[in-house]
Interface confidence: medium
């Protein structure tokens, strides 16, 4: 039966959740009613064989290999270990046991689509004009921001932040052209007057 | 925008099979895992399966395998589903929907397939 | 595989009450998401992650839950919430949706 030392499922009226031989109406923690009686709910780890009787205890048996069950419970069937498939680009961050499922996560540059994760995106890229905010992670994608007056970005990137436009004027030089969000500006020696 | 748009309706014979596309426009279909969902008389909702935009690798609802593929063109960002030999049971409207935050974020105008003789 | 029930299958409501429908899962899921859909239009994100709200819902609509019991409210309802609500799971293939719940308004 498995049961933990602490919790053992004894048979007395205690245990019945009655009085007077009246059948019980509600059970103790970590027991379910069946049949006018409380029976031992199967710990993690392991499912449900058959209820009890007034003459024998819950039948509990150990989940399989690649199965899992997390919590006090009376299901006849364990659930199947999460697989997490490189075709979506998952991989395993910690396989599972007996009463915890394995948890997948994404491959270097890839991050879930959502928090369950169930399948996997690249990093999202920041367009010309956009910088990167905050770089992505395996549960979070980059997070992008339009550069402002006076920055720019002229590349696709997952990594680079906005670039400040150079300083014509620390270079004795002036602006021969304009910036944008996506050009830095041109520098160009000043016209002398002849 | 993110938009989905899918190819317009359909009437089909039994026994045949027949493609649905979905196109994405407003970001990089790459972005986001595709997703295709069924939906009988208005209500129920199933979902078929999914792929993985950028590696192409699918994953099934086993009562759909053999009834759906699931393929994606990155070059011109369609996704494309599928349906082979055709029954009245699989008249419905097919949904395509762009999974990228946790949920089913963007959803195509769905497609409506009618299968009779 | 995993059902969802949601309940009741059908509600009506008056402008202004406060609307609870439920969505319990035949086993335990991490997340459940919500989706609402208006007749002849797709269904759109409304709440995913069990509590985020989807851009451009009203704050009169939360989420929560965890386990096997998920529900949506919404505070105050209003005319323009007249629609069909969707939970889904994302917890084992098949990934499923519940049978919804049709919300009407007086």
């Known amino acids: 039966d498995y049961k933990d030392d602490d919790d053992k499922d004894y048979k007395d009226d205690d245990d019945k959740g009655g009085s007077g031989g009246e059948p019980p109406t509600a059970c103790r923690e970590k027991q379910y009613l069946i049949n006018s009686q409380c029976c031992s709910l199967c710990q993690p780890g392991q499912k449900l064989v058959s209820d009890c009787t007034e003459f024998t205890e819950t039948e509990c048996l150990p989940c399989g290999e690649s199965e899992f069950l997390d919590t006090w419970n009376r299901e006849t069937h364990c659930h199947q270990h999460k697989y997490c498939d490189p075709n979506l680009g998952l991989r395993v961050q910690q396989k599972g046991t007996s009463e915890t499922d394995t948890i997948c996560t994404c491959e270097e540059g890839w991050h879930c689509t959502s928090e369950a994760c169930e399948s996997c995106v690249l990093h999202r890229s920041c367009s010309p004009g956009f910088g990167v905010k905050q770089i992505a992670t395996g549960v979070s994608d980059t997070i992008c921001e339009p550069c402002p007056v006076g920055f720019f970005s002229n590349v696709s990137s997952a990594f680079e932040k906005c670039h400040p436009w150079t300083s014509c004027e620390t270079k004795d030089l002036v602006v021969q052209q304009a910036g944008t969000n996506k050009t830095d500006v041109v520098c160009g020696p000043q016209d002398r007057l002849r | 925008e993110v938009q989905l748009q899918q190819s317009g309706p359909e009437l089909v014979k039994p026994g045949a099979s027949m493609k649905i596309s979905c196109k994405a426009s407003?970001?990089?279909?790459?972005?986001?895992?595709m997703n295709w969902v069924k939906q009988s008389h208005g209500k129920n909702l199933e979902w078929i399966g999914l792929?993985?935009?950028?590696?192409?690798?699918?994953t099934y609802n086993q009562k759909f395998k053999g009834k759906a593929t699931l393929t994606v063109d990155k070059s011109s960002s369609t996704a494309y589903m599928e349906l082979l030999s055709l029954t009245s049971e699989d008249s419905a409207v097919y949904y395509c929907?762009?999974?990228?935050?946790?949920?089913?974020?963007?959803w195509g105008q769905g497609t409506s397939v009618t299968v009779s003789s | 595989q995993i059902v969802l029930t949601q309940s009741p299958a059908i509600m009506s409501s008056s402008p202004g009450e406060k609307v609870t429908m439920t969505c319990s899962a035949s086993?335990?899921?991490?997340?459940i998401h919500w989706y609402q859909q208006k007749s002849g239009t797709s269904p759109k994100r409304w709440i995913y992650?069990?509590?985020k709200l989807a851009s451009g819902v009203p704050a009169r609509f939360s989420g929560s839950g965890s386990g096997t019991s998920y529900s949506l409210t919404i505070n105050s309802v209003e005319a323009e919430d007249a629609a069909t609500y969707y939970c889904?799971?994302?917890?084992?293939?098949?990934?499923?949706f519940g049978g919804g719940t049709k919300l009407e308004i007086k």
């Open positions: 929907a762009g999974t990228g935050t946790g949920a089913m974020d963007y």
């Open positions: 889904q799971q994302w917890r084992t293939n098949p990934y499923t």
């Open positions: 407003g970001y990089s279909i790459t972005g986001y895992t």
């Open positions: 086993s335990s899921v991490s997340y």
């Open positions: 792929i993985n935009t950028y590696t192409g690798g699918t």
């Open positions: 992650d069990t509590s």
